[in-house]
């Protein structure tokens, strides 16, 4: 607790002080006072530099004195033998004695009192910037007229802050300009313009004279401009050292003028104005700016249009252009949007074809579709090459965005039929010789696959079973073989409207229009053992002549068995219709004259006993295409016959091509279109 006075005595005083003692006293008087310390008695062992015994007086880090020996007063009216005056309110006194004393020393007696200090004169650093007023225990500062005392209660300055300039144009000068500016002042000016305008400051060199920098280059008085996180300055010296035109890129500017106690000059004067905030003419690749201008400023709007093949992707939506506005902060709106190459995406897969995984799916990339050859070909042309177009679609030169269609190749067997192992009336065949051959198990019959969804057969095969089970791809009709082959499920049976339905089909004598179509539920996958036969063309090239050869195949009756286990086939010539009429019906169900012969029928056979028979019905009479020798077309369908091993009658398919096409078109699925 600070005291105004006090007494300090060495140990045992006035007796001799003991050896090996170290004692200290911390003196503290109230703040605003100094300390007057005086000794009235001093009797301490004398040594050089008071090394043995001593009394030490310390103020802060400074040793004010170190005493030893004997002292007596020089003034008979005063008991003081030694005194110290310090302008601080704290003092430390330390007494030390060593291990021995040659004589008996009595030590010291000292007293301290608090004394007033004159803060205005007693210190090197003047506490007040202008006027200093001392009083007992303290001081206060005061200012000349028109100055005010700052919050620190020491510095005076002029009241030059708080001005806010909002006009788009204006002039600001230092206080008293062009007379000397006040010392020890901090002047702050604020320019606050409407958003979207930047403050532009202009100065003339001659309008600036501020106390120059010190030898280290630090401005003693300074002018600083602060715009957001950007600072211009500090500036000082004779003549403005900075740019005469300062574009702040901000609508808010703080001007700070700081002066010290010395060296007042005339100061400075500046002009400012608000410029609409400029936005940079950015280089946005793959795009065009509309309108094109040398400079864009606040509130300007441009339309940025992507070049062909480029698009703006925002979220999941692609657009070809976007608008951008020069904003109040000097930045363009939508600046994140970029014109990127159009991405056509992973190309769609196609049925019975493939597309190689593209290296790139971006604008300009090229892909190629191919069909699963040799079983499928590209029906709608175009070569299968597509490029990624500017609209984001894969486009073909011929088809545009329409995908290629892989359709089955018709009439081409994987292996040609050769009559190698002769069997009476025909040969063993492999399904690869007749990949269009369809097996019907109830009734036991045949049919011809004409495309993925359709089987052509005789009307009499399906008239009694409108849900036939069919199989493709197997040479043998043994159960274990059929279990491994492809079973076809019918969706609908279409019998030719000209086919007469009878109460008792067994007694039929009229086989005119013996043709039917079976629509399948699912498309058939083509391959070496399953592939369609072509339909005849409508031109006269497809009119059969007597002697023209055709191939028949099936699992019908043979000389040995009612039903063949493995596919049999024969090559037969076309014969005149009369040849069929002349053959006596084997097991007639009516008079021979009752049997109907029409131009819708083809007569064939008669050679070496080769003929179709019961169980072959509905199978194709395949003839080489006159316009493409590599292909076969279904010239006829096994229909009926007077006697197995003679001549047989076949439905003339050419006469039904229009009905076939119309039926298929009217009953196609969207997938097939």
């Amino acid at each position: 607790e600070p005291t105004m006075y006090g007494e300090i005595l060495s140990p045992n005083y006035p007796q001799a002080y003991p050896s090996e003692v170290e004692k200290s006293w911390d003196i503290e008087v109230p703040e605003g006072y100094g300390i007057h310390l005086y000794f009235t008695h001093l009797d301490i062992e004398l040594s050089e530099n008071c090394a043995y015994d001593s009394v030490q007086i310390i103020s802060g880090d400074t040793e004010e004195g170190r005493l030893c020996g004997q002292r007596s007063s020089n003034n008979p009216h005063s008991p003081i033998v030694e005194e110290f005056q310090v302008p601080y309110n704290k003092l430390q006194v330390i007494f030390k004695s060593d291990f021995s004393n040659e004589e008996r020393f009595t030590g010291f007696a000292a007293y301290y009192v608090a004394t007033d200090i004159n803060e205005c004169t007693d210190f090197v650093d003047v506490p007040c910037s202008h006027f200093c007023n001392n009083f007992i225990g303290g001081y206060f500062c005061s200012c000349p007229p028109e100055y005010f005392l700052h919050d620190d209660m020491k510095n005076c300055g002029v009241n030059c802050s708080g001005d806010v300039f909002t006009a788009l144009i204006g002039e600001i000068a230092s206080p008293n300009y062009p007379k000397p500016y006040p010392e020890n002042s901090r002047c702050e000016y604020q320019i606050r313009l409407e958003k979207g305008f930047q403050v532009v400051v202009t100065l003339r060199r001659e309008d600036f004279d501020v106390e120059a920098a010190d030898s280290a280059g630090n401005c003693l008085d300074s002018l600083v401009f602060v715009a957001g996180d950007r600072q211009f300055g500090p500036y000082c010296g004779h003549g403005f050292p900075g740019p005469l035109n300062i574009e702040t890129k901000s609508n808010a500017l703080d001007i700070i003028f700081q002066t010290d106690l010395t060296g007042q000059k005339k100061g400075w004067k500046l002009r400012y104005h608000g410029d609409p905030m400029p936005c940079p003419k950015e280089d946005t690749p793959n795009s065009v700016w509309e309108p094109a201008k040398a400079k864009y400023v606040f509130r300007d709007v441009v339309q940025i249009t992507c070049l062909d093949g480029f698009e703006v992707v925002e979220g999941r939506v692609g657009a070809t252009s976007f608008y951008s506005t020069c904003q109040s902060n000097g930045k363009w709106s939508n600046s994140k949007l970029k014109c990127q190459p159009v991405d056509c995406g992973i190309p769609e897969s196609i049925e019975n074809g493939k597309v190689e995984d593209p290296e790139s799916t971006l604008f300009g990339s090229v892909i190629r579709y191919t069909c699963e050859e040799p079983y499928y070909y590209m029906e709608n042309g175009g070569g299968g090459e597509y490029h990624c177009a500017g609209n984001g679609s894969w486009v073909n030169e011929v088809l545009g965005p329409e995908l290629p269609k892989c359709v089955p190749v018709c009439g081409v067997p994987r292996e040609p039929f050769e009559e190698k192992q002769r069997i009476i009336g025909g040969s063993d065949a492999d399904i690869k010789n007749f990949p269009w051959q369809v097996f019907f198990d109830n009734p036991w019959a045949g049919g011809a696959l004409i495309n993925e969804y359709w089987v052509l057969t005789a009307a009499h095969v399906v008239e009694g079973n409108r849900e036939p089970t069919m199989y493709v791809g197997s040479t043998s009709v043994q159960t274990s073989r059929l279990a491994k082959s492809k079973m076809l499920t019918p969706e609908h049976v279409f019998i030719h409207p000209g086919w007469k339905l009878l109460e008792v089909p067994e007694g039929r004598t009229n086989f005119d229009n013996d043709i039917a179509l079976v629509r399948l539920k699912d498309p058939v996958k083509m391959g070496p053992t399953v592939s369609p036969i072509c339909l005849p063309g409508t031109s006269s090239d497809y009119n059969l002549m007597d002697g023209d050869l055709g191939l028949i195949s099936g699992w019908g009756r043979t000389e040995k068995r009612d039903r063949a286990v493995r596919l049999k086939a024969a090559r037969l010539p076309v014969a005149p219709l009369r040849k069929c009429k002349e053959v006596k019906v084997e097991k007639p169900t009516a008079d021979a004259e009752a049997y109907v012969f029409t131009p819708n029928m083809i007569c064939a056979g008669g050679e070496k006993g080769m003929d179709s028979c019961k169980g072959d019905s509905g199978g194709a009479f395949a003839v080489q295409d006159p316009n493409d020798k590599t292909k076969f077309y279904a010239a006829g369908l096994v229909s009926w016959g007077p006697q197995c091993g003679t001549y047989g009658l076949y439905t003339r398919v050419k006469n039904y091509v229009d009905w076939i096409m119309k039926t298929m078109q009217e009953n196609s699925t969207p997938r097939e279109d």
Partner: antibody, heavy 119, light 107 residues
Framework: QVQLVQSGAEVKKPGASVKVSCKVS????????MHWVRQAPGKGLEWMGT????????IYAQKFQGRVTMTEDTSTDTAYMELSYLRSEDTAVYYC????????????WGQGTLVTVSS | DIQMTQSPSTLSASVGDRVTITCRAS??????LAWYQQKPGKAPKLLIY???SLESGVPSRFSGSGSGTEFTLTISSLQPDDFATYYC?????????FGQGTKVEIK
């Protein structure tokens, strides 16, 4: 109609082999697929295997793999089934059966051959 | 190999009853399933093939249904001649395995 005539009953000792024959008449063996089925007394039917003429390979039930051999002599239209390393549980009636067509599994059955394995 | 599980193993019924026998395949066999009837000392007789097709000469009281893995044989009205053992057989895979059989006996 195909007829299948099998060889007569056999009595064999454990560890021995038995060869059962099956003669086809009314058709040729080349046109047929022959299967073999057995039935132990009071037990169920067990399919043993078949010769697949299309693939030219014999397919055996897992249970008999390594012990059974099925062969055919097309010149005499006779099929054979040989079972080796016989054990008492092989005592059964062994049938040869022709495979049917168009979804019918078995067409014609032989009269059966009783093989008795006893020490 | 595909396993065939037939149930029940024994079934007691009276003449005129409707009888159902179930056969379950361990994996799909499409419709490649047959049903046989066997009487003691005789070779099995085919009743149903391709799951639901009735073999010629078999009375219409026998019917089959199902596809994939679940199949049933139904005798709509049991006759005295129908007391026998019935077997299912799959013939989809190379191994044409039989079920273990269901004996239909007089109640």
């Amino acid at each position: 109609q195909v007829q299948l005539v099998q060889s007569g009953a056999e009595v064999k000792k454990p560890g021995a082999s038995v060869k059962v024959s099956c003669k086809v008449s009314g058709d040729t063996l080349t046109e047929l697929s022959m299967h073999w089925v057995r039935q132990a007394p009071g037990k169920g039917l067990e399919w043993m295997g078949t010769f697949d003429p299309e693939e030219g390979e014999t397919i055996y039930a897992q249970k008999f793999q390594g012990r059974v051999t099925m062969t055919e002599d097309t010149s005499t239209d006779t099929a054979y089934m040989e079972l080796s390393y016989l054990r008492s549980e092989d005592t059964a009636v062994y049938y040869c059966v022709t495979e049917g067509l168009a979804g019918i599994p078995f067409d014609s059955w032989g009269q059966g051959t009783l093989v008795t394995v006893s020490s | 190999d595909i396993q065939m599980t037939q149930s029940p193993s024994t079934l007691s019924a009276s003449v005129g009853d409707r009888v159902t026998i179930t056969c379950r395949a361990s994996q799909s066999i499409s419709s490649w399933l047959a049903w046989y009837q066997q009487k003691p000392g005789k070779a099995p007789k085919l009743l149903i093939y391709k799951a639901s097709s009735l073999e010629s000469g078999v009375p219409s009281r026998f019917s089959g249904s199902g596809s994939g893995t679940e199949f049933t044989l139904t005798i709509s009205s049991l006759q005295p001649d129908d007391f026998a053992t019935y077997y299912c057989q799959q013939y989809n895979s190379p191994s044409w395995l039989f079920g273990q059989g269901t004996k239909v006996e007089i109640k």
